[in-house]
C-alpha cells in the first residue's frame, strides 16, 4: 500500500492503492548536493547522473572506517524520495548529484559554494529546462552561502533546503535563512512537527512550509534492492523538491515567486499542532504542509 | 526561506575591522570610507579557522579576483606567512578561497575590491 508520506502529499482523487503519476517531473533536472550515492540502486538506476564534482572535508577521527554503504546512505535515500520508482515523489525527474558531504554527513560552506558555482557554470554551458537544487544540509548563518543562493535563484534556479534539525529558529541557519530559498520543515503522519531525539524540526519565519519528514521509506544503500526509513528536514525538503519538479514540468515557465505561491496555495492549511513550537514562534511559523495540486490539474500533473 | 523578511543576522557574529593605514603601496586603494567586514559562524564548534572566503565587490572580474588573490599572497609572504589559494570564484560570486593564518585578516580586509571575508564553517546532513 502507499506509504503515508506519499498519501499525504497526494490529492484525494488519486488516493487509490498506489501513488503513480507516470511521468511526473520529466522536464526538470534536480541537482542534489549531498553525500555520495549508490546510483545503481534499483529504485533510482538510470535516474541519477553522478557528476564528477566532489568537495568534502576529511572524516573526523583516526579510527574512522570508510564503509561505502554508510557513505552513500543519506544521499541515496534522498535521491529515492525525490525520484524513486516505487517510493519517490517525482518519478519522472532526472537528477544530478554533487558530493559536498563526507561519509559522516559533514561538509563545508566553501565546498557547498563551489558546488553551487559548478551548477551555475553547467547551466551556462548547457542550458536545459527548469532546474531545482536540493540542499539537504544546514550550517550556522552564513552571509556568503545565502548570497550565493540568492545569485543562483536570480539566475532562474529553484533552490529547496532543509530547515534544520535543531529545534530552533531556522533564521539562525544557512541556507535555511536565505530569503530566495524554499525552506522546508518536517512533520509526521499525525501532522505534528517532527521530534528528532532531544531536538526536532526548525521553525520560525524563515520556514516557508512543512512536508513529511518522519519515517520516510526510501532507497537504502545497504543493498541494491533495500529500503529504509529515515527522518529529518532533509526528507521533508526532498518531498518539496519533487513536488516543485512536477509543478515545473507541468508549467516550465513558472517564476520562483509563482512556484512559491503555488506551493503555498496547494498546501494543507492549519493542520499542524502549533503547541510544539515556542510560544513566540507560533505566529511566525507557517502552518502549511506541502501537497500536489488537486485533480483539477489532472491533465498537467498526471498525464 | 520565507521571502519578504529584512536581512537579519541573528546571533551571527560580524567583526568590523576598519581600514587604517594605506600601507604596502596598494595600486588600487579602496574607496574612501568603505569598510570590509569579517564574518564567522556564531556556533564555535562549527568554525573552521584557517580557511576564508574572500568575497569581492559585485562587478569584480575574474582577472581582478586572481590579481587580488596574488597580491594577498605576495603581501603575506613579505610578512613571512604561507598562504594557499584553494579556489577562485566566478560565475556566482566574485572572490577566492584561501588557506591562511587568521593573523592576515586585517591585511586581507584592506585589499582592493574586498566586500567581506567569511571564515569557513561546517555544514551537516539534516
Amino acid at each position: 500500500s502507499i506509504p503515508w508520506n506519499l498519501e499525504r502529499i497526494t490529492p484525494p482523487r488519486y488516493r487509490a492503492d498506489e501513488y503513480q503519476p507516470p511521468d511526473g517531473g520529466s522536464l526538470v533536472e534536480v541537482y542534489l548536493l549531498d553525500t555520495s550515492i549508490q546510483s545503481d540502486h534499483r529504485e533510482i538506476e538510470g535516474r541519477v547522473m553522478v557528476t564528477d564534482f566532489e568537495n568534502v572535508p576529511e572524516e573526523d577521527g583516526t579510527r574512522f572506517h570508510r564503509q561505502a554503504s554508510k557513505c552513500d546512505s543519506h544521499g541515496t535515500h534522498l535521491a529515492g524520495v525525490v525520484s524513486g520508482r516505487d517510493a519517490g515523489v517525482a518519478k519522472g525527474a532526472s537528477m544530478r548529484s554533487l558530493r559536498v558531504l563526507n561519509c559522516q554527513g559533514k561538509g563545508t560552506v566553501s565546498g557547498t559554494l563551489i558546488g553551487l558555482e559548478f551548477i551555475r557554470k553547467s547551466q551556462l554551458v548547457q542550458p536545459v529546462g527548469p532546474l531545482v537544487v536540493l540542499l539537504p544540509l544546514a550550517g550556522g548563518y552564513s552571509r556568503v552561502l545565502n548570497a550565493a543562493c540568492q545569485r543562483l535563484a536570480r539566475a532562474g534556479v529553484v533552490l529547496v533546503t532543509a530547515a534544520g534539525n535543531f529545534r530552533d529558529d531556522a533564521c539562525l541557519y544557512s541556507p535555511a535563512s536565505a530569503p530566495e530559498v524554499i525552506t522546508v520543515g518536517a512533520t509526521n503522519a499525525q501532522d505534528q512537527p517532527v521530534t528528532l531525539g532531544t531536538l526536532g524540526t526548525n521553525f520560525g519565519r524563515c520556514v516557508d512550509l512543512f512536508a513529511p519528514g518522519e519515517d520516510i521509506i526510501g532507497a537504502s544503500s545497504d543493498c541494491s534492492t533495500c529500503f529504509v526509513s529515515q527522518s529529518g528536514t532533509s526528507q521533508a525538503a526532498a518531498h518539496v523538491a519533487g513536488i516543485a519538479a512536477m509543478m515545473l514540468s507541468a508549467e516550465p515557465e513558472l517564476t520562483l515567486a509563482e512556484l512559491r505561491q503555488r506551493l503555498i496555495h496547494f498546501s494543507a492549511k492549519d493542520v499542524i499542532n502549533e503547541a510544539w513550537f515556542p510560544e513566540d514562534q507560533r505566529v511566525l511559523t507557517p502552518n502549511l504542509v506541502a501537497a500536489l495540486p488537486p485533480s483539477t490539474h489532472e491533465n498537467l500533473y498526471f498525464q | 526561506g520565507a521571502m519578504g523578511q529584512e536581512d537579519e543576522d541573528g546571533d551571527y557574529e560580524e567583526l568590523v575591522l576598519a581600514l587604517r593605514s594605506e600601507e604596502d603601496g596598494l595600486a588600487e586603494a579602496p574607496e574612501h570610507g568603505t569598510t570590509a567586514t569579517f564574518h564567522r559562524c556564531a556556533k564555535d564548534p562549527w568554525r573552521l579557522p584557517g580557511t576564508y572566503v574572500v568575497v569581492l565587490k559585485e562587478e569584480t572580474h575574474l582577472s581582478q579576483s586572481e590579481r587580488t588573490a596574488r597580491r594577498l599572497q605576495a603581501q603575506a609572504a613579505r610578512r613571512g606567512y604561507l598562504t594557499k589559494i584553494l579556489h577562485v570564484f566566478h560565475g556566482l560570486l566574485p572572490g577566492f578561497l584561501v588557506k591562511m593564518s587568521g593573523d592576515l585578516l586585517e591585511l586581507a580586509l584592506k585589499l582592493p575590491h574586498v566586500d567581506y571575508i567569511e571564515e569557513d564553517s561546517s555544514v551537516f546532513a539534516q
Epitope: P22, E45, V50, R85, D86, S224, T225 | -
Partner: antibody, heavy 115, light 109 residues
C-alpha cells in the same frame, strides 16, 4: 550507442565451470548494474542475478546462489558471470542486460552442457 | 513453474487489438510500479517494450500500451501487424529479485 557485447558460445562437460563475459559501452556505467538472465531451449526467461559496476555488490537469485559468481573489471568495462558444477539443465542462452530495468540486452551466449 | 502467470498463447488478425495478462501477487506485480514487458523474436534477445507499468521506451510504437490493476498487469497491442508475431514476457520486481512470466506466444493470423 549503448551496447552490451557478450563472449562466444561454449560447450562444457557436466561438473565443469563456464565464464561468460559482457562488455558494456555507450553509457555511464555506474548508473546501472548488470543483470544476467538465461533461457533454456524453448523455455522462458530466468533472472540469475545482478552486479554493481559502482561497488561490485551482487544480488543472486536463490536458485543459483552458491554456484554463480559475478565479477566486474572496471578497467575494461566488463562483467563476468561464472557458473560452476554445470548440469545438463544449465544448457541455455545466457544474456546480460543493463540494470534491473533490463532496457538493453547483449546478443546472448549459448552454453551447452553435454557429456 | 514461473512466478508470474501469462496465457501460453494469444492470436489476432491484422488490425485487431489483443491484450496479454500477467498475474502475480501483492509481493511482486501488486507491490511495485516496476512491471516491464519484453518482445522476443526467435533467435534474438528480448526487447523492452513497456517499463514501469505503462511507459514506452523511445522507438517503441505507440500501438503498445501497458496498465495494471491490483496484482494483474496487461499489455495491449492495437492495430496488430505481422511483425508483432513473437513471444512476449512480463517481468516484475520482488522484494529482493526479479521474476518473469512464462511467456505468451502471439500469433498474427
Amino acid at each position: 550507442q549503448i551496447q552490451l557485447v557478450q563472449s562466444g558460445a561454449e560447450v562444457k562437460k557436466p561438473g565443469a565451470s563456464v565464464k561468460v563475459s559482457c562488455k558494456a559501452s555507450g553509457y555511464t556505467l555506474t548508473s546501472y548494474g548488470i543483470s544476467w538472465v538465461r533461457q533454456a531451449p524453448g523455455q522462458g526467461l530466468e533472472w540469475m542475478g545482478w552486479i554493481s559496476f559502482y561497488n561490485g555488490n551482487t544480488n543472486y537469485a536463490q536458485k543459483v546462489q552458491g554456484r554463480v559468481t559475478m565479477t566486474t573489471d572496471t578497467s575494461t568495462s566488463t562483467v563476468y558471470m561464472e557458473l560452476r558444477s554445470l548440469r545438463s539443465d544449465d544448457t541455455a542462452v545466457y544474456f546480460c542486460a543493463r540494470g534491473y530495468g533490463m532496457d538493453v540486452w547483449g546478443q546472448g551466449t549459448t552454453v551447452t552442457v553435454s557429456s | 513453474q514461473s512466478a508470474l502467470t501469462q496465457p501460453a498463447s494469444v492470436s489476432g488478425s491484422p488490425g485487431q487489438s489483443i491484450t496479454i495478462s500477467c498475474t502475480g501477487t501483492s509481493s511482486d506485480v501488486g507491490g511495485y510500479n516496476s512491471v516491464s514487458w519484453y518482445q522476443q523474436h526467435p533467435g534474438k534477445p528480448p526487447k523492452l517494450m513497456i517499463y514501469e507499468v505503462s511507459n514506452r521506451p523511445s522507438g517503441v510504437s505507440n500501438r503498445f500500451s501497458g496498465s495494471k490493476s491490483g496484482n494483474t498487469a496487461s499489455l495491449t497491442i492495437s492495430g496488430l501487424q505481422a511483425e508483432d508475431e513473437a513471444d512476449y514476457f512480463c517481468s516484475s520486481y520482488t522484494s529482493t529479485s526479479m521474476v518473469f512470466g512464462g511467456g505468451t506466444k502471439l500469433a498474427v493470423l
